[in-house]
């Protein structure tokens, strides 16, 4: 309900006798406000008083009336200044001014906190003309006030290029406390102190804070807002909230969970994304982080061969992106792989171990002890070698690749021969006489071609020369062996 408070008809200052066009009791009320506001409307009003210091809200007209009496300064009448009401109540307030009829087209605008109020506001201006003056009443109503309606309202009227400004009407909307800072969820170390903050404002103030832990009040006596709760430490998860109390009632903050940091759970779903001869790309799904961010992870790799010495290779990596390429592995080998991750509290247990295998690779070493000699009777070059060590074959040998380059008087041609895996000798036909033949051999697996051996050179003379001495792979350190026949 709206209570109406009416201003009594009062003489206009500087006018002798009654003020022309003074308001009658059946006119629009000058102030309306809810019962809840705590006002005594009869005490709210007083006439405009001359000699006030706040200039800028009075315009002194230069015109005189028909009787040549000087016109009074124009000023808005006083109304209630500070209106206090509860949220969601209705309020109506106004500005009133009496303007001599010589002024035309007077408009009144409403302003809040220095900004003009335009659009969807309930502002009504009513005119009450009389012989000499027109009483203008600008009313502003808010049907259900909200906190955002708090502030200073003024009326402005432009007249003769002068701006007349009313005294402010301050609307104070009182309601339940409004949180400006609520406690935040936290992850804390066991038995370590931490702080929670709660801040709420009115009006009305003061706002008092009670803290609640797991549905029980923490503090017997309320603390004035803002309040900081120091919790000496927790051993298990707890839920905290704060209650903000003022004269209008109580508002409860959101409940926040305070978690105790722990070691993470082991990663799950370790899987093989890709395998090569010497590397395995793995991925994993991190386990629960124990309320503390993962710092890094450790990949543990064991040879799955029962005859291996059981040593574990450890590779450390960042926690993201849950992917790691394990390198320096042997080809065609079986491995057990486990992953463990750590946070600030410690390491998780190792994930379930998974089996993974590397693929065949190209051999990592060349055939050894390559020897080359000329069999002139058959016009062939005989080549012999030793196969690379099994461990360094990186797969099952499928054969060898022989490169032989023939160089003579500026002509050079390279030929490649493929030889089966059985045996360790080969015979190639002499391609050019009076030339140098350079031979290199590589082992071949399904994984590819290994490195070629160091070159071995043999001179093939013109027909009729005899050669009994073989050429062979040099001892390490000899760069480019040539056998002179």
């Amino acid at each position: 309900a709206i209570t109406e408070a009416r201003e009594e008809a009062k003489p206009y200052p500087l006018f002798p006798g009654p003020f022309p066009g003074s308001l009658q009791t059946d006119h629009t009320p000058l102030l309306s406000l809810p019962h809840a506001s705590g006002y005594q409307p009869a005490l709210m009003f007083s006439p405009t008083q001359p000699g006030r210091p706040h200039t800028g809200n009075v315009a002194i007209p230069q015109v005189t009336s028909v009787e040549s009496k000087p016109l009074p300064p124009l000023a808005f009448k006083h109304t209630v200044g500070h209106i206090i009401l509860s949220e969601h109540k209705g309020v109506k307030f106004n500005c009133s001014i009496s303007v001599p009829n010589i002024y035309q087209d007077t408009t009144i605008s409403w302003w809040k906190d220095g900004k003009e109020l335009l659009g969807a506001h309930h502002a009504i201006t009513q005119f009450y003309p009389d012989d000499e003056v027109t009483a203008i009443i600008a009313s502003f109503s808010i049907t259900s006030v909200q906190r955002s309606d708090n502030g200073s309202y003024i009326c402005k009227m432009k007249i003769n290029n002068e701006e007349i400004v009313s005294d402010p009407i301050y609307i104070e909307v009182q309601g339940l406390p409004h949180f400006t800072k609520q406690p935040e969820s936290m992850n804390v170390t066991r038995n370590t102190a931490f702080n929670l903050t709660c801040q709420a404002v009115g009006p009305p103030e003061p706002v008092n804070i009670f803290w609640v832990q797991n549905s029980s009040r923490v503090n017997e006596q309320p603390e004035k807002s803002p309040s900081v709760l120091t919790v000496p430490g927790l051993t298990e998860m707890a839920v905290f909230s704060c209650e903000a109390h003022n004269d209008k009632g109580l508002t409860v903050s959101k409940g926040v969970q305070i978690n105790i940091k722990a070691i993470p759970s082991p990663p799950t779903e370790v899987s093989i994304r890709n395998s090569t001869a010497h590397s395995i790309l793995i991925s994993w799904v991190p386990g629960f982080d124990g309320y503390s961010p993962f710092r890094n992870c450790s990949i543990q790799v064991k040879e799955a061969d029962p005859l291996s010495n059981g040593s574990v290779m450890i590779f450390n990596t960042s926690a993201l992106p849950h992917l790691y390429q394990i390198k320096q592995l042997q080809a065609l080998a079986n491995y057990s792989i486990g992953v463990s991750c750590m946070n600030e509290i410690g390491w998780s247990a190792v994930s379930p171990w998974i089996l993974a295998s590397t693929t065949e690779g190209a051999p990592s070493v060349a055939p050894l002890n390559v020897t080359v000699f000329l069999n002139e009777s058959s016009d062939n070059v005989d080549i012999r070698w030793m196969k690379p060590p099994t461990k360094q074959q990186d797969g099952e040998l499928v054969g060898y690749r022989i490169s032989h380059v023939w160089q003579s008087a500026g002509i050079s041609k390279e030929l490649l021969e493929e030889v089966g895996q059985n045996g360790s000798r080969a015979r190639i036909s002499v391609q050019v006489h009076n030339a140098t033949c350079t031979v290199r051999i590589a082992a071949v697996t399904r994984g590819g071609v290994g490195p070629f051996s160091d070159p071995v050179k043999i001179f093939i003379p013109a027909h009729g020369w005899v050669d009994y001495a073989p050429s062979s792979t040099p001892a390490p350190g000899n760069a480019d062996p040539v056998l002179i026949i």
Partner: antibody, heavy 121, light 111 residues
């Protein structure tokens, strides 16, 4: 809460700066005023700094005092040329209403305990 | 500036009695008036604002009234704890300035 500091004994004419340190108060939302009280006398309003940083002074205080916001939690009152008449307890006080406005109804809701300034030869 | 005149300067009353303090503004301040209580060695504490509105936690024995230039603070059912100095304050303002001023104070002695 509010707490004044910087009050001490100085000789006339020696500039003096008092500081009001606030906690749990957002100075971008509230005005902060200074009020003094001479020994055995009444309260005397000096001036105020609004949430927007606009300053207003009592007529008698203009030119003699300067109020400034020095950080998000401190407001200073500078007494430019103190005389023995400026001997008083100086209080800082928070305006009652929040809002980023240059002016408003500034009665004082929260007060500091005060700091004593003595001006003597 | 607005000048606030407070009367009387001192008043004495018995426990259970009533005290009335008046405050006059040199010009109309509407209802922009607050009342404070101050005890020795302490900062002031707001009792009433908007001329008649009781601040939080203030007993209803304190009553403010008035508007314009004439204001009254009435303390009924006096208690020993009410012994203090009481000040009125104008906090009138316009769109260009602020007109804060305190009254001279009234000492209330409770016997």
């Amino acid at each position: 809460s509010l707490e004044e500091s910087g009050g001490r004994l100085v000789t006339p004419g020696t500039p003096l700066t008092l500081t009001c340190t606030v906690s749990g108060i957002d100075l971008s939302s509230y005005a902060l005023g200074w009020v003094r009280q001479a020994p055995g006398k009444g309260l005397e309003y000096i001036g105020i700094i609004s949430s927007t940083g606009t300053t207003y002074y009592a007529t008698w205080a203009k030119g003699r005092f300067t109020i400034s916001k020095t950080s998000s939690t401190t407001v200073d009152l500078k007494i430019t040329g103190p005389t023995t008449e400026d001997t008083a307890t100086y209080f800082c006080a928070r305006g009652a209403y929040a809002g980023y406005v240059a002016f408003g109804p500034y009665y004082f809701h929260i007060w500091g305990p005060g700091t004593l300034v003595t001006i003597s030869l | 500036d607005i000048v606030m005149t407070q009367t009387p300067a001192s008043v004495e009353a018995a426990v259970g009695g009533t005290v009335t303090i008046k405050c006059q503004a040199s010009q109309s301040i509407s209802n922009f008036l607050a009342w404070y209580q101050q005890k020795p060695g302490q900062p002031p504490k707001v009792l009433i604002y908007a001329a008649s509105h009781l601040a939080s936690g203030v007993p209803s024995r304190f009553k403010g009234s008035g508007s314009g230039t004439q204001f009254t603070l009435t303390i009924s059912d006096l208690e020993c704890a009410d012994a203090a100095t009481y000040y009125c304050q104008s906090y009138f303002y316009s769109s260009t300035s602020i007109y804060n001023a305190f009254g001279g104070g009234t000492e209330v002695v409770v016997r």
